[in-house]
């Protein structure tokens, strides 16, 4: 039930009245407005932009609204010397060379300031020699490679394909293996949906589309110079050859066209199986190096693109809680896109710009928020998520002690079959109720809530009647108030089918092709995806901000750490006998979940029945709420990722886009058999046992009555 | 130490199927391929198909036109080989070797398809 | 699909001396032949892969050549327990194809 009664206003301003504000129409303008231009980091028009946005939510009755600036690592192509890659003969002639741009959209073909395809932060080389496809470079990819089929990358060049895991983590990965280049390219299989056009016709990758990305190994960051603290005016600053998460190998991206004249060449050794092939039709041949006639040919890498500190501007909008103001709760997303960020990030842009609008309308009116709400318009974050980290680093200290929820707000689509949710758990029981009060915009559903659809589209894999809500993972914005700080967090989109689409996120992601036609024509005509995600984010931030009692449910942490216990330890009982003789134990997990079970379930006895009519019990109350995330927070960090600092939940090491629970133990426990030294791995997993049963117990006594 | 133990020897009628099962010990299940070859009685050896384990990827020699399925269950570390619609020229013994290189193989089964 | 052609058909060599196998592929495989060592009633085991890479625990007697299309399995001092039939076997290409091998026998 949505609760109004924190501020002594008139009864019609609830959260009806803000969601009733919402309008696709605006959603829609907002979107055209955002993307008829480039707006890349660092650049002068994201820096209008910035400014233009800060002028309107002033406009729509913000308290106020302040540009935040930094001056962070940014990369950029070199303008005249282009990157490319090409085979050469045996004497040394480009026999052939990849496209040095994207052909351009209709209707773009003037449009200046379009950055060419490449990997960010990619350093400078030109390395030439053999090819190796290595699939999707996960971690499995290279043990296949590596373990079974006895294929050596050192000093090679590694061709694979996009999806599955970040583009960082595949890169790392070829580092690992001793690679020399990577090129990555974007294979039908995973990037052209059977049945559908490519752009201009439909949502699908041409074959001279490509995408864009950063491929840097953060692990939370932010600036590559100045971990930890913030890029302002009298920062100190690591040399380059100190900075974090930077690639030591050439990287350039490349479409279909040119993979097919590359993988078509391929000799070796075949493909281990079916996983390996994608869609082209080519052999898909591992190598090492080209077949027969073309054995002699080489493939080599021309990049020049440099790394250069830029100034870069968040936009920080202040809405002032009327009760409870030094509480935040903060709805961010980015501004800067790779061209013209048709879906990343305007399509989440304009429905933060139409959820401030609301607000604001709401507040000309005489309402306030309880709380104080901030929203943010996040620079860089294609960069590494740069804007929102050196922002948060600035505001640690004031985050840490009044920072009740984050809420994200990139893309606000990646399909349109069903809502996406991924979040804590204090936040199930929010998402389930306010999507019980909207309505659902899917075609079939006339009538019903958000929540059926929801939930027979795609439901729980463990619950009857539920949907999935899956792990926070990283890759956006929320990193680093969930992952270092401890905010609850959550994310919400609409997105494809997964069971009919095995594609990696959408085919024109970071492509020159992700233009307002993309979703005006293809993905929302009528705006009411858009529309569904903008109540689904500004209901989130409503309730947070104006709730009595913080809609956070502890029990339903209970439950996930149960889940995740009983995981961690069928991954250890897959080694019986190490686990016998080293004397590994999960009990003191077990009696820790178990601990926080009681202890969670008599708290919210307790919330159920407490005066809260009296401030000093509210406030006591909502502050254990507010601050039981902040418990899973471990202040030296995971091992080799201090950034990363929640215990229950961290980016995955082998893909930085999926979460993992319990990653302590589960990266201790990863590949372990392989290990030379078994006594000092295993050591390691009874101490990330210790550390995760502390945590959880820990996290349960501030639940705990206070005396 | 690496060891395939392969299922006991099958006497099969025309038209039938047969399902061999290989358990494997001694390494990491999912990291190594599984392949499944056939040798007829004092013949060479013949591929018919391989599996990933992690992932279930499979690949099949065409020769057996959808006659054969390759399978794995990860709980127990062990593939199976099932040939249907069995004939008489079907007759061999069937081997599972782990890893792409073939690095380790089990001891066979003898498959004798008889009216 | 690739054929792998074995020559000779069999071998007779005093113990001591050399054996040089020989392993054609219809089409260009690259390094990719494997070579197999199978005793009367036992199952084939690995011997050379990647055309010239010895196997775990495989002496050193025996040793892989060529890429291409032409290939070699040398064994340079036979000894009785290398009494056995020799396959050799392309990864290159789907079907994988091993050749009819070759019967190895002490003079």
């Known amino acids: 039930k949505s609760s109004n009664e924190a501020t002594n206003i008139t009864p019609k301003h609830n959260m009806k009245a803000f969601l009733d504000e919402l309008k696709a129409e605006n959603i829609k303008k907002f979107l055209y407005n955002f993307t008829q231009i480039p707006h890349l980091a660092g650049t002068e028009q994201n820096f209008q932009l910035a400014k233009q946005i800060q002028s309107q939510w002033k406009e729509f009755g913000l308290d106020s609204v302040e540009l935040a600036h930094y001056d962070v690592l940014l990369s950029y192509p070199n303008k005249t010397h282009p990157n490319y890659i090409s085979i050469i003969n045996e004497d040394g002639n480009e026999i052939f060379n990849t496209s040095l741009f994207e052909p351009p959209p209709p209707g773009y073909e003037n449009v200046s300031d379009i950055v060419p395809p490449f990997s960010a932060f990619s350093p400078q080389g030109m390395p030439e020699g053999d090819l190796v496809y290595v699939n999707y470079a996960r971690t499995e990819d290279f043990f296949k490679l590596e373990r079974d089929m006895k294929i050596n990358c050192s000093g090679k060049i590694v061709i694979a394909r996009y999806g599955k895991v970040f583009r960082g983590n595949k890169v790392k990965n070829a580092q690992l293996a001793g690679a020399k280049g990577v090129i990555l390219y974007s294979d039908p299989a995973d990037y052209f949906a059977p049945g559908v056009k490519s752009y201009p016709d439909g949502w699908n990758l041409p074959g001279g589309g490509v995408q864009r990305g950063n491929i840097l190994n953060l692990n939370g960051a932010g600036d590559p110079l100045t971990p930890g603290y913030p890029a302002n005016e009298y920062a100190y600053r690591r040399g380059i050859a100190e900075a974090v998460g930077l690639p030591s190998i050439p990287v350039h991206p490349i479409g279909y066209y040119d993979a097919q004249k590359l993988l078509e060449k391929m000799g070796g050794s075949a493909p281990p199986d079916s996983s390996w092939r994608g869609s082209l039709k080519v052999p898909y041949n591992v190598g090492p190096g080209f077949t027969g006639n073309f054995s002699t040919q080489k493939v080599k890498m021309h990049i020049h693109s440099t790394n250069e500190v830029t100034r870069i501007y968040n936009v920080i909008g202040t809405l002032r809680g009327a009760v409870e103001p030094d509480r935040y709760v903060i709805l961010g997303g980015h501004r800067d896109s790779w061209v013209f960020g048709g879906i990343d990030p305007q399509s989440g842009a304009a429905v933060v710009h139409e959820i401030v609008r609301s607000f604001g309308t709401l507040k000309k009116e005489g309402w306030r928020p309880r709380r104080t709400i901030l929203f943010a318009s996040w620079d860089a974050e294609e960069f590494g998520l740069l804007g929102s980290t050196e922002w948060a680093e600035e505001n640690s200290r004031l985050l840490q002690e009044r920072g009740v929820a984050y809420i994200n707000a990139d893309s606000s689509i990646e399909g349109n079959y069903t809502l996406r949710v991924d979040c804590t758990p204090l936040m199930y029981s929010l998402v389930h109720n306010l999507t019980k009060e909207l309505k659902s915009p899917d075609e079939g559903f006339e009538g019903k809530s958000l929540y059926e659809s929801w939930t027979k589209k795609s439901p729980s894999p463990e619950f009857s009647g539920m949907p999935r809500i899956s792990k926070l993972g990283s890759g956006n914005d929320f990193e680093v108030f969930f992952q270092r700080l401890g905010i609850a967090s959550g994310r919400a989109r609409y997105t494809k089918n997964w069971e009919t689409n095995k594609f990696s996120g959408y085919p024109l992601y970071h492509s020159v092709y992700e233009t307002y036609e993309l979703v005006e024509k293809f993905y929302d005509p009528m705006f009411k995806y858009h529309l569904t995600v903008a109540q689904v984010r500004g209901g989130m931030v409503f309730e947070l901000a104006n709730s009595i009692v913080l809609p956070f449910d502890c029990r339903d942490y209970a439950v996930v750490l149960r889940k995740y216990a009983d995981k961690i330890y069928s991954i250890s009982m897959k080694h019986p006998q190490e686990m016998k003789t080293y004397s590994v134990s999960f009990d003191s997990l077990f009696s820790a979940v178990k601990n926080f079970t009681e202890i969670a379930s008599k708290f919210s006895e307790r919330l159920q029945d407490f005066d809260k009519s009296n401030p000093i019990v509210l406030r006591m109350m909502n502050d254990q709420l507010m601050f039981l995330e902040r418990a899973f927070i471990d202040p030296l960090g995971l091992p080799d990722r201090p950034f990363y600092r929640h215990v229950i939940y961290a980016p995955s090491s082998h893909n930085k886009y999926a979460g993992e629970s319990f990653p302590g133990i589960y990266d201790a426990l990863f590949d372990i058999e392989s290990k030379v030294d078994p006594s000092k791995a295993w050591g390691e997993v009874k101490r990330q046992i210790y550390v995760a049963a502390f945590t959880v117990q820990a996290a349960a006594e501030t639940l705990s009555e206070v005396a | 130490e690496v060891q395939l133990v392969q299922s006991g020897a099958e006497v099969k009628k025309p038209g039938a199927s047969v399902k061999v099962s290989c358990k494997t010990s001694?390494?990491?299940?999912?990291?190594?391929?599984i392949h499944w070859v056939r040798q007829a009685p004092g013949q060479s050896l013949e591929w018919m198909g391989n599996?990933?384990?992690?992932?279930?990827?499979?690949t099949y020699n065409q020769k057996f036109q959808g006659r054969v399925t390759i399978t794995v269950d990860k709980s127990t570390s062990t593939a199976y080989m099932e040939l249907s619609s069995l004939r008489s020229e079907d007759t061999a013994v069937y081997y599972c070797?782990?890893?792409?290189?073939?690095?380790?193989w089990g001891q066979g089964t003898l498959v004798t398809v008889s009216s | 699909d690739i054929v792998m052609t074995q020559s000779p058909d069999s071998l007779a060599v005093s113990l001591g001396e050399r054996a040089t196998l020989s392993c054609r592929a219809s089409?260009?495989?690259?390094?990719?032949v494997d070579w197999y060592q199978q005793k009367p009633d036992q199952s084939p085991k690995l011997l050379i892969y990647?055309?010239?890479t010895r196997h775990t625990g495989v002496p050193d007697r025996f040793t892989g050549s060529g890429s291409g299309t032409d290939f070699t399995l040398t064994i340079s001092s036979l000894q009785a327990e290398d009494v056995a039939v020799y396959f050799c076997?392309?990864?290159?290409?789907?079907?994988?194809?091993f050749g009819a091998g070759t019967k190895v026998e002490i003079k």
């Open positions: 070797a782990a890893g792409w290189n073939f690095d380790y």
């Open positions: 001694g390494y990491t299940f999912t990291e190594y391929t």
């Open positions: 089409q260009d495989v690259g390094t990719a």
């Open positions: 990647w055309a010239s």
């Open positions: 599996i990933n384990p992690n992932n279930g990827g499979t």
């Open positions: 076997q392309q990864k290159n290409s789907y079907p994988l194809t």
